[in-house]
C-alpha cells in the first residue's frame, strides 16, 4: 500500500523536511503533490510526468519544493504555515489513480529564556517570591531547576500559569539557591541563566565566644560575637547595661576583679530591622602567688640519701598538689606526703627519681603550677659495657672499643690490656691489629663524686680462622605448645655469617622458626615434641667455616590420653585381669588406677587374679606429668560373666 513518511515529523522553522514515498506502484505515468488531505487543483504544489521527466509547478508551489523521480518531495526553509497534511496523487499507466496522505508539524526554535522576579530581597518567614519564565511561548513546556536539581516536593513551592510561574511561599534562608527555568518544544530546549535568590534573615540569637566565663586578674579579656544574619549583622557591646562599642569583638587588656559583670552583645540587621541580644556573666578572680619548690638536698646519692621537697609559700586553707613526670604521684612506699601535702619526701632516692617535680596551689578557678624541679641524683658507675660485643676479630682490621657505664656525674674511663694501663679515654682504638693484639681488655669506670669504681674484662681474639662454635639455649626443657626456645650461636664474631641445620638439613620454612640477631639467634615458638631434634650452628668468614656440636632439644610434653590394653572388656569368671596403661609423655608419667572411683595402686600395670562378677565395674587409668604439670585419664568398663 502506498504510504508517506515525514522525515522528520516535527520540523524546526527554517529547516527542511522530506516527504518520503513508500511502496510506489510499478508502471507509472506520473504523480502530483497537493497541500491538504485531498486532491484539489487549486492547492497543487507540483506535478511530474515520468516519460518526459518534466516537473510542472502548481498554484501552491512556493519555490521551496523539490520533487524527486521516486516521487518523494523535499520542502526547504520551512515556515510555520507549512504545518499540515500533504497528499500524493499517483497516475498509473493504466490511468488508474492512487492516493496517499502524510503530514508534519512545524515548531519555532525557542529563544533562551530568562527569569523575572516579583521580589529581589524577600524577608525570611514573611515574604513570598514569584519567579516567571520569559517569554511566553505557544506549545512550549516549562521546567524549573534549583541548584541544578529538579524541584523538590514542598508545600511552600507552587507551579502555576502552565508551569511558567514558580512561587515560593514564606521564604526561608535555605531557599537561598540558584534557580533556572527551561523551555522545551518538540524541536528545541533552552535553559535560562541562573538567578540567585537573596533571602534576608536574622539576626539569630548571637553567640558569644569563648564560652569561658571565669578569668584571672591580669589576663586579657577577648570576647567575640556572632549572629547568623543576611546582610551581616551590626554589633554593639554593653557591660552592666552601659554601651561600650559597636564592634564584633570586645577586647579588654589586663582585667581586674572590677571587670566582673554582665556582658551583652546586641546584633542588628538594618534590612530586616530586627535586633537580638545575648548576655554572658564574666567573673574575674584575684591572682594567687606562683608557687615554687625548695629542696633540702640538691645532690643526693643513690640508695643513701633522702630528699624533702617543699612547696612555697605557705598559705592557710590552701590545697597543695604534686606531680612527677607530668603525672600525679604514683603509689610508692618511698614517697611520703606531709599532713598538709606541702612537703614531699623521697626516701632512699634512686636514679629514676630525677623528676621533673612540680607542685601546685589550687584556687577557685584553676591550679597554679610551680616551675619544674629536677633532682641531680648521684649514682654509679654501674658495671661498664664494652661494645661492640664481638670477641673475634680478623687481622688487619681496626679495633675500636667503646666503654660505657651509667654514672652521674659521667664516669671517667681507663683502659688496660693484659693488666697494663693504656689510656684514660672512653674509646680505645688500635689500627691494623695482628694476632699479638689478642688478650684481656679491661675497662675501668670511676665516679669522682662517689669515689666508686667498676671494671669489665673482655677477651679479644685476633684470628682470621674462626673457632668451633657452640650453642647456648635460654630454655633447656621447654614445654610443648607453651614455651619458646632461643638458641644462640657463640661466639659473636665480626664479619661472620651464621648458619643453622636441623637433623643435618638446612632450616625448614616454618612460621614457628625465626632467625634474628644477624642469624645468630634461632627462635622456636610454641615448641612441639617434633622439635626434639639435633640443632647445629655454623659460622663462616672469608677463610674458614666451622660447625658446632649438635644440641638436642628436650621437649617436655604430655601426658596424652592414655590407652588401656588389652582392648577386651568381657572376661570369664576365674580368669586373671592384667591391664596395662600407656601414655605418650616426656618425662614418663606417673600412673595410678581407680576401680569404681576407689584409688588402687600407683603402677603402670593393674593385675587381679581369678576375677569374679564382683570385679565388674569401671577401671580408670590416671596419668600425670610432674614436669609439664598436666594430667590425663581414660575409663574402661569391665564385665565378668559367671
Amino acid at each position: 500500500k502506498l504510504t508517506i513518511e515525514s522525515t522528520p515529523f516535527n520540523v524546526a522553522e527554517g529547516k527542511e523536511v522530506l516527504l518520503l514515498v513508500h511502496n510506489l506502484p510499478q508502471h507509472l505515468f506520473g504523480y502530483s503533490w497537493y497541500k491538504g488531505e485531498r486532491v484539489d487543483g487549486n492547492r497543487q504544489i507540483i506535478g511530474y510526468v515520468i516519460g518526459t521527466q518534466q516537473a510542472t509547478p502548481g498554484p501552491a508551489y512556493s519555490g521551496r519544493e523539490i520533487i524527486y523521480p521516486n516521487a518523494s518531495l523535499l520542502i526547504q526553509n520551512i515556515i510555520q504555515n507549512d504545518t499540515g497534511f500533504y497528499t500524493l496523487h499517483v497516475i498509473k499507466s493504466d490511468l488508474v489513480n492512487e492516493e496517499a496522505t502524510g503530514q508534519f508539524r512545524v515548531y519555532p526554535e525557542l529563544p533562551k529564556p530568562s527569569i523575572s522576579s516579583n521580589n529581589s530581597k524577600p524577608v525570611e518567614d514573611k515574604d513570598a517570591v514569584a519567579f516567571t519564565c520569559e517569554p511566553e511561548t505557544q506549545d512550549a513546556t516549562y521546567l524549573w531547576w534549583v541548584n541544578n536539581q529538579s524541584l523538590p516536593v514542598s508545600p511552600r513551592l507552587q507551579l502555576s500559569n502552565g508551569n511558567r510561574t514558580l512561587t515560593l511561599f514564606n521564604v526561608t534562608r535555605n531557599d537561598t539557591a540558584s534557580y533556572k527555568c527551561e523551555t522545551q518544544n518538540p524541536v528545541s530546549a533552552r535553559r535560562s541563566d541562573s538567578v540567585i535568590l537573596n533571602v534576608l534573615y536574622g539576626p539569630d540569637a548571637p553567640t558569644i565566644s569563648p564560652l569561658n566565663t571565669s578569668y584571672r586578674s591580669g589576663e586579657n579579656l577577648n570576647l567575640s560575637c556572632h549572629a547568623a544574619s543576611n546582610p551581616p549583622a551590626q554589633y554593639s557591646w554593653f557591660v552592666n547595661g552601659t554601651f561600650q562599642q559597636s564592634t564584633q569583638e570586645l577586647f579588654i587588656p589586663n582585667i581586674t576583679v572590677n571587670n566582673s559583670g554582665s556582658y551583652t552583645c546586641q546584633a542588628h540587621n538594618s534590612d530586616t530591622g530586627l535586633n537580638r541580644t545575648t548576655v554572658t556573666t564574666i567573673t574575674v578572680y584575684a591572682e594567687p602567688p606562683k608557687p615554687f619548690i625548695t629542696s633540702n638536698n640538691s645532690n643526693p646519692v643513690e640508695d643513701e640519701d633522702a630528699v624533702a621537697l617543699t612547696c612555697e609559700p605557705e598559705i592557710q586553707n590552701t590545697t597543695y598538689l604534686w606531680w612527677v613526670n607530668n603525672q600525679s604521684l604514683p603509689v610508692s612506699p618511698r614517697l611520703q606526703l606531709s599532713n598538709d601535702n606541702r612537703t614531699l619526701t623521697l626516701l632512699s632516692v634512686t636514679r629514676n627519681d630525677v623528676g621533673p617535680y612540680e607542685c601546685g596551689i589550687q584556687n577557685e578557678l584553676s591550679v597554679d603550677h610551680s616551675d619544674p624541679v629536677i633532682l641531680n641524683v648521684l649514682y654509679g658507675p654501674d658495671d661498664p659495657t664494652i661494645s661492640p660485643s664481638y670477641t673475634y676479630y680478623r687481622p688487619g682490621v681496626n679495633l675500636s672499643l667503646s666503654c660505657h657505664a651509667a654514672s652521674n656525674p659521667p664516669a671517667q674511663y681507663s683502659w688496660l690490656i693484659d693488666g697494663n694501663i693504656q689510656q684514660h679515654t672512653q674509646e680505645l682504638f688500635i689500627s691494623n691489629i695482628t694476632e699479638k693484639n689478642s688478650g684481656l681488655y679491661t675497662c675501668q669506670a670511676n665516679n669522682s663524686a662517689s669515689g666508686h669504681s667498676r671494671t669489665t674484662v673482655k677477651t679479644i681474639t685476633v684470628s682470621a680462622e674462626l673457632p668451633k662454635p657452640s650453642i647456648s639455649s635460654n630454655n633447656s626443657k621447654p614445654v610443648e605448645d607453651k614455651d619458646a626456645v632461643a638458641f644462640t650461636c657463640e661466639p659473636e664474631a665480626q664479619n661472620t655469617t651464621y648458619l643453622w641445620w636441623v637433623n643435618g638439613q638446612s632450616l625448614p620454612v616454618s612460621p614457628r622458626l625465626q632467625l634474628s640477631n644477624g642469624n645468630r639467634t634461632l627462635t622456636l615458638f610454641n615448641v612441639t615434641r617434633n622439635d626434639a631434634r639435633a640443632y647445629v650452628c655454623g659460622i663462616q668468614n672469608s677463610v674458614s667455616a666451622n660447625r658446632s656440636d649438635p644440641v638436642t632439644l628436650d621437649v617436655l610434653y604430655g601426658p596424652d590420653t592414655p590407652i588401656i590394653s588389652p582392648p577386651d572388656s568381657s572376661y570369664l569368671s576365674g580368669a586373671n585381669l592384667n591391664l596395662s596403661c600407656h601414655s605418650a609423655s616426656n618425662p614418663s608419667p606417673q600412673y595410678s588406677w581407680r576401680i569404681n572411683g576407689i584409688p588402687q595402686q600407683h603402677t603402670q600395670v593393674l593385675f587381679i587374679a581369678k576375677i569374679t562378677p564382683n570385679n565388674n565395674g569401671t577401671y580408670a587409668c590416671f596419668v600425670s606429668n610432674l614436669a609439664t604439670g598436666r594430667n590425663n585419664s581414660i575409663v574402661k568398663s569391665i564385665t565378668v560373666s559367671a
Partner: antibody
C-alpha cells in the same frame, strides 16, 4: 654439582697484562668468597687473595698488591683475575677456589687452573 | 707473615707403611689444614681444622697438633696416596702454605 671452569692458557709478553676468568656452576658466587692461588713451575702454592662477589670487598697478600686485581660479574657467575706488569717470575698456574657456604670446609672446590707463560 | 716449615721435603714409603708429615708455624695458629696434589691436577683438601677428614677422604688419613706444631698421618700407605702434601694456615693474613712434602711409593 659445584664446578669452577677456568679460561685457557695464556702466552704474554713481559710488561704486558692478562685477565683470567673463573666461571662457577652449581652455586651462586654471591653466596661465597672466591680465592686465587698460584703455583710456579716445580714450586709450592702461593695465596694471592680473595674477593667477596656480593659487595666487591677484597683482601690481597702484600706481595700481590698492585700486581693482581680481582673483579666479578654476578650476572654471568664469573670471577676475574687481572695481572699487570708481568715478568718471568709471574709464569705459573693460577687457580681459583672457594668453599660453599653450606659446607663446613673452605678451599674445597678448585678450578682446573690456567697456565700463564710470560715471554721476554 | 706466618711461615710454615714442612718436613721432610721428600719421603718414600712402602704400601702398608705408616707415614707422618710435620708442619711447624713461626707463630701460633688455631688450626692447620692439609692439601694433597698430584702432578697435573688441582690441589685437593684432605684435612681441615687440624683433625677433620674432608669429604671422600679415606679414614687412613688423620691430623693432629696445636699451637705451632702440627702433623698429617697416613696409617697405611697405599699407591694412590703418592702425591705432594701442603699444610696451610688461615689464622692471619696473608694466608700461607708450607713448601710441600713429596710422598713417593717405594
Amino acid at each position: 654439582q659445584v664446578q669452577l671452569q677456568q679460561s685457557g692458557a695464556e702466552l704474554v709478553k713481559s710488561g704486558g697484562s692478562v685477565k683470567l676468568s673463573c666461571t662457577a656452576s652449581g652455586f651462586n658466587i654471591k653466596d661465597s668468597y672466591m680465592h686465587w692461588v698460584r703455583q710456579g713451575p716445580e714450586q709450592g702454592l702461593e695465596w694471592i687473595g680473595w674477593i667477596d662477589p656480593e659487595n666487591g670487598d677484597t683482601e690481597y697478600a702484600p706481595k700481590f698488591q698492585g700486581k693482581a686485581t680481582f673483579t666479578t660479574d654476578t650476572s654471568s657467575n664469573t670471577a676475574y683475575l687481572q695481572l699487570s706488569s708481568l715478568t718471568s717470575e709471574d709464569t705459573a698456574v693460577y687457580y681459583c677456589n672457594e668453599g660453599t657456604p653450606d659446607g663446613p670446609y673452605y678451599f674445597d672446590y678448585w678450578g682446573q687452573g690456567t697456565t700463564v707463560t710470560v715471554s721476554s | 707473615e706466618n711461615v710454615l716449615t714442612q718436613s721432610p721435603a721428600i719421603v718414600s714409603a712402602s704400601p702398608g707403611e705408616k707415614v707422618t708429615i710435620t708442619c711447624s708455624a713461626s707463630s701460633s695458629v688455631s688450626y692447620m689444614h692439609w692439601f694433597q696434589q698430584k702432578p697435573g691436577t688441582s690441589p685437593k683438601l684432605v684435612i681441615y681444622s687440624t683433625s677433620n677428614l674432608a669429604s671422600g677422604v679415606p679414614a687412613r688419613f688423620s691430623g693432629s697438633g696445636s699451637g705451632t706444631s702440627y702433623s698429617l698421618t697416613i696409617s697405611r700407605m697405599e699407591a694412590e696416596d703418592a702425591a705432594t702434601y701442603y699444610c696451610q694456615q688461615r689464622d692471619s693474613y696473608p694466608l700461607t702454605f708450607g713448601a710441600g712434602t713429596k710422598l713417593e711409593l717405594k
